[in-house]
Interface confidence: low
């Protein structure tokens, strides 16, 4: 399937123009490529009329340009003076030649209609209304008024001033005058539809000395918007209808042959087939709203609706926009896993893909839930703490630039099983859609920490170990301290690795952590896990309390556990030690309204990057007052 | 005066058929927007299936797709709904609802039991 897109069918009249958008994959190579528009004839062949080499045809000399915009991924194709000879197919393309990647596009040019030379022309969209101006004689100020729609063989009545209403026109059509000017009457038709297109006869009086004015109504669908998007990609559709409708049910649907199917609306109607990844949002008081929908998929290519009725279902009459989505599968947007599969009291770890070119975006993880019209709260960000609830379960490791961040979820429950959202501050199309399921653990976990009740006695010596099976032998094995900035890595090192796979002692495979003297600041969440360069895997996390020793009795109360934790982890034995940099609270992220939920998802505001050390390896700062710290293998 | 007068509704053993209609009177069912909501008890109102003025696309709730059918008989200004292959979970009060000129008029409703 050829990757280029633009409008399938373009119309117009003789002596207008018309500006044709084709859109390509954003590519370097495309982007410097020739662009062309030809005509296809009978044989097959496809003549070019002109191309941005600077070809340009005979016939097109003098009326039509082709203008590529890089940065767009777009050309456009403007053609004046069109005739009906110009009516036929075309294509739009690129390439050297004209058998390259190319989109056909069919061009009607139509005779302007012969009209009565008095005929006043309305233009109005389906389902908005019109006010037609009917003019008429001081004369004829006590006589009827009327507005009738020509057929083929009269002019049947819509409305007049005795009251008398057409049924087809009950509730819609009103005939009125304004303040005392007896010159003049209007009729307002609302909700209009195709079948109200025509003309239109308005008079005053009868016989020979009525005035009358002939009218002709044209009632336009709405123009479909393209929309070229990648695969895995994330669209929004912005709709404005008007305040006229701000009060009522707005929907999304996607056209089917006659029918257009309901995908989403605000009374709670949602396709199971955007389960997970789509949200509606109203924006304002004036009936704009948009729907987002993330994980685009080759599918969802089609023809969308929007409109607003109270019954939330597309309605005759009613205003609606339209759009022509194109989904490409020439994607720059990773194929990563869409369904990441966990078990009880284990953990995941998830790559989020990111627009490499905004390595300094502020990333961010989201859960959506499907109530009302969709949301997505955030649960943890680079400069959004975590959520209370994943307290010591949940961080965000960045890995400036390479295009990836991971959020690590770990003491899992079947509650957390659903669809989460990876996305940024930046370019909005790579909001991506994981589903998260969680199954029963069925077998002891991969790591397991000695001592499971961890309670580190104030002033003391303190060892935790973390154990691991042969098969994590070659991977990069660490502890971190985490707090609701992220998990700070502690330096490590691993001697286990060093054995050869044939050699592993299952029973030896430890990584342990030494607090030596135990201090207030080491309470906290410690995390154990396993990585390979930047790719996290398994996890485990341990809660340490800190008690005092008191006569009495052995141990006191542990204090809060958000305590902020001053751990190190250092080869053998070196007389140093590690804490972390101050935490300071940071304020909410301001990317979305409503607190911590991503709502107004379509126009999130540019943030200035706070130098947050959230997630990073290296968040710990030496000091110099010493301590001994023991890593055992 | 508006006046939507629904009938037909009454007790079915399970996989039975109904049919459901819609008496309207001041207003013409060729040109107004009618709608099917029913009521389980101890439940809030939920649209079963609708149908547009020009009649060519009638809408149906997931659950009732395939079972279910929306016909207007214009003559005799009448809309009906009918239904088969019924099932307990569609026990409910069926009201018709009609959307003329930006207002909603509503039926005094018809209970439909399935039950064995």
């Known amino acids: 399937k050829s990757p280029i897109f633009g409008p399938q069918e373009v119309s117009s009249i003789e002596g207008d123009s018309v500006s044709i958008t084709c859109y390509y994959p954003d590519t370097s190579v495309n982007r410097h490529t020739r662009k062309y528009w030809c005509r296809q004839g009978a044989s097959g062949m496809c003549t070019t009329l002109i191309s941005s080499n600077g070809y340009l045809s005979k016939e097109y000399s003098g009326r039509a340009n082709l203008i590529n915009f890089p940065e767009n991924n777009t050309f456009v194709i403007n053609i004046e003076q069109l005739t009906q000879d110009d009516t036929g197919s075309y294509k739009c393309g690129l390439g050297t030649s004209n058998r390259g990647l190319s989109f056909d596009v069919s061009l009607e040019v139509s005779q302007v209609p012969e009209l009565p030379s008095d005929t006043h022309v309305y233009t109005k969209d389906i389902g908005r209304n019109v006010t037609i101006e009917c003019p008429f004689k001081r004369e004829n100020a006590p006589s009827k008024k009327s507005l009738c729609k020509k057929t083929n063989q009269s002019c049947e009545l819509v409305i007049d001033s005795t009251e008398k209403v057409n049924p087809s026109y009950i509730g819609r059509a009103k005939l009125f005058m304004k303040g005392t000017d007896l010159t003049v009457f209007y009729v307002n038709i609302s909700h209009l539809t195709h079948n109200d297109a025509g003309l239109y006869i308005c008079q005053a009086g009868e016989g020979p000395s009525a005035d009358k004015k002939n009218v002709d109504l044209q009632v336009l669908a709405p123009e479909p918007e393209l929309l070229y998007k990648d695969l895995r990609s994330s669209v929004t559709f912005e709709c404005d209808l008007g305040r006229e409708v701000a009060n009522e049910a707005k929907y999304l649907c996607r056209m089917n042959k006659e029918t257009c199917d309901v995908i989403i609306n605000t009374l709670g109607k949602r396709d199971p087939d955007f389960e997970g990844r789509i949200l509606i949002t109203p924006k304002d008081d004036n009936g704009r709203f948009s729907v987002l929908i993330t994980g685009l998929r080759k599918e969802d290519a089609g023809h969308y609706q929007c409109g607003a009725h109270s019954s939330g279902l597309p309605q005759e009459g009613w205003p609606i926009q339209t759009w022509q989505l194109f989904v490409n599968e020439e994607s720059t947007i990773p194929n990563r896993r869409s369904v990441v599969k966990g078990v009880t009291g284990g953990s995941v770890a998830i790559a989020c893909p990111y627009n490499p070119k905004e390595s300094s975006s502020l990333k961010y993880w989201c859960r959506w839930e499907g109530d009302g019209n969709g949301h997505c709260p955030v649960l943890v960000g680079t400069q959004a703490q975590v959520q209370e609830e994943y307290e010591g379960r949940l961080a965000l490791f960045d890995q400036p630039g390479n295009g990836t961040y991971t959020v690590i979820l770990n003491q899992l429950t079947t509650e957390d099983a659903g669809f989460y959202w990876c996305l940024t501050n930046g370019d909005s199309r790579w909001r991506t859609t994981i589903e998260l399921q969680v199954a029963e653990a069925t077998r002891e976990p991969n790591l397991e920490v000695t001592p499971q009740n961890a309670t580190a006695v104030l002033g003391e010596t303190f060892t935790v170990s973390c154990h691991y099976p042969c098969k994590f032998y070659s991977q990069e094995k660490y502890w971190c301290k985490w707090s609701n900035k992220g998990c700070h890595i502690l330096p490590s090192h691993d001697e286990g690795a060093r054995q050869s796979s044939v050699s592993c002692d299952q029973s030896s495979q430890l990584v342990s952590m030494t607090l030596n003297p135990v201090s207030k600041e080491d309470e906290g969440w410690y995390w154990c896990g396993v990585k390979q360069g930047q790719t996290y895997g398994e996890t485990t996390a341990i809660y340490i309390a800190v008690e005092e020793r008191t006569r009495g009795s052995s141990h006191v109360n542990p204090t809060d556990a958000n305590a902020r934790a001053k751990v190190a982890l250092e080869e053998e034995v070196v007389d140093s030690s590690i804490s972390e940099k101050e935490n300071k609270a940071i304020p909410n992220p301001g990317p979305f309204a409503n607190e911590r939920e991503i709502q107004n998802v379509g126009d999130q505001a540019q943030e200035n990057r706070a130098s947050g050390d959230a997630g990073s390896a290296d968040g710990q700062s030496r000091s110099s007052s010493s301590k001994h710290h023991h890593h055992h293998h | 005066q508006v006046q939507l007068v629904e009938s037909g509704g009454g007790s079915v053993q399970p996989g039975g058929s109904l049919r459901l209609s819609c008496a309207a009177s001041?207003?013409?069912?060729?040109?107004?927007?009618i709608m099917w909501y029913r009521q389980p008890p101890g439940r809030q109102r939920e649209l079963v299936a609708d149908?547009?003025?020009?009649?060519?696309?009638?809408t149906y709730t997931e659950s009732v797709k395939g079972r279910f059918t929306v016909t207007r008989d214009n003559a005799k200004n009448t809309v009906y709904l009918q239904m088969s292959g019924l099932k307990p979970e569609d026990t409910a009060v069926y009201y018709c609802?009609?959307?003329?000129?930006?207002?909603?008029?509503w039926g005094q409703g018809t209970q439909v039991t399935v039950s064995s």
């Open positions: 001041g207003i013409d069912v060729s040109i107004s927007t």
């Open positions: 609802n009609a959307f003329v000129r930006r207002e909603n008029y």
């Open positions: 149908v547009i003025p020009s009649g060519r696309s009638t």
